[in-house]
Amino acid sequence: DASGDLLNTEAHSAPAQRWSMQVPAEVNAEAGDAAVLPCTFTHPHRHYDGPLTAIWRSGEPYAGPQVFRCTAAPGSELCQTALSLHGRFRLLGNPRRNDLSLRVERLALADSGRYFCRVEFTGDAHDRYESRHGVRLRVTAAAPRIVNISVLPGPAHAFRALCTAEGEPPPALAWSGPAPGNSSAALQGQGHGYQVTAELPALTRDGRYTCTAANSLGRAEASVYLFRFHGAPGTST
C-alpha cells in the first residue's frame, strides 16, 4: 500500500483565498448539440493535494439530483467518473486546477434548467463548497435535419432504404417514391433521443425515393436513387 508514501508540501505565506465559485448566468445550446457548463473556483487551502470529489447536480443547490460525480485520489489530476447520468456528462476541467467545467452531450429539451457545481475536499482539510445560483442551461428546439439516407441490400435481391433525421421535437418521417400513389409505407422507429429512423422495407421500382422530416420548426428532405442495370443487383445513389 502506498498510502504512507505521500509527498510533503511546503508551507506558503501567501494570503489565503476565500471559497468562491465562478459560473456564467446562462448557457444556450441547441437540442442535439453539446454544451459546456463552465465552473471555476477558489479555495483557502492553497496547496491541497488530498482526495477530492467534483459534483454537478440539477434543479436546486444542495438537494437536487446529481447528474455527474468524479473522485480524484491524493496527488492525482485524474478524476475518475463515478456517475454520469445516461453517460452524457463528462468533466472537461481539471479539479486540481480549480476547474469543474462540464460537457453535456446530445442535449434534449428536457435538459433545460439550472445546474450547480460542487467540490468536496475529503482529506485533512475537510471542506466543501457549492455554487448557490448555478448556471441556467437553455436548450432550444431544433428544426429537422436529415443526417443519413441510404439504400441497403435486403432479402432475396431486393433493396431497402433507411433515413435518419434529428430535431427537437423529434421529427415525423415519411417516404415517397415511384410506387403507385407516389407514397410508400415506412417503418418508423425511435432512435437515440432526438434522432429518429424510418425504413422503407422493399424498394420495388427504380427511381427516386425521398425522405421528408418535419416538426413544428420546419421540414427537411433528401433523396436517393435506385437503378438496377441489366437485371443485376446494384444501385446508383
Epitope: 500500500d1 502506498a2 508514501d5 505521500l6 509527498l7 511546503e10 501567501a14 483565498q17 477558489t42 492553497r46 496547496h47 480524484a72 485520489a73 491524493p74 496527488g75 492525482s76 489530476e77 485524474l78 475518475q80 467518473t81 486546477r97 480549480n98
Partner: antibody
Amino acid sequence: QVQLKQSGAELVKPGASVKISCKASGYTFTDYYVNWVKQRPGQGLEWIGKIGPESVSIYYSEKFKAKATLTADKSSSTAYMQLSSLTSEDSAVYFCASYYYGFAYWGQGTLVTVSA
Amino acid sequence: DIVMTQAAPSVPVTPGESVSISCRSSKSLLHSNGNTYLYWFLQRPGQSPQLLIYRMSNLASGVPDRFGGSGSGTAFTLRISRVEAEDVGVYYCMQHLEYPYTFGGGTKLEIK
C-alpha cells in the same frame, strides 16, 4: 512499495512496430495517469503522452501522435505503448512514470533499437 | 509549445559547497490558482529520472532538504547546499502547465 516494471529491451527492424509494457504495483493503478517519456542515447527527455486507466483520458504530444499509441489494461494494472513505422530516430530508451503528480515513480526504462 | 531553457550544459562544484542550477520558460508557468507548474528531476548516470521538486518549490518525498526550488513565473532555480558525491547526474526542469509537457535540455552536475 510503489513499482513500475517495464518490459525488456527490443531489437526491431525499420518499418516494423513494437509494443512495450509498464506494470504497476504498490498503489491503485486506476487512480493515476501513466506518462511516457523518450530519451535518445546521450540526449535529453521528451514527453510522449499520458493515459488514464479507463483509456478515455489520453493526451499525446503532437509530435508523437502518429508514432505512439497508448493503451491500458486495468485488470493487470499495465500500461502499454505501441510504436509504429519504426526508423532509426525511434531508437531510444522509453520510460513510463506514474503515481503522485504523474512523475513520482519511474520505470527502469525499455531500450528499443531499430536496426536492419 | 512552451520552451524550457537550461542555459548551462554543465556546472562544476566542489563537494560540501552549494550550487544553483537555473531554468527559464518561454511562458509564465504561474496558474491562476497560485501554483507554478514546474518540476525538477535528477537523472543519475545509468538510472531513471527521479522527482526532486514539484510545483516549483515543494520537496518530493524522500528527497534531502539540501535541495530547494524557487523562482518567479518564468525563471527558476534549483539550489543544492552541501553537495555530495551522490548528487552527480543531469538535472532537468519540466513544465506541466499545458500540453505538451516540455523538458529543459538538462544541466550536468560535475564534481571538481
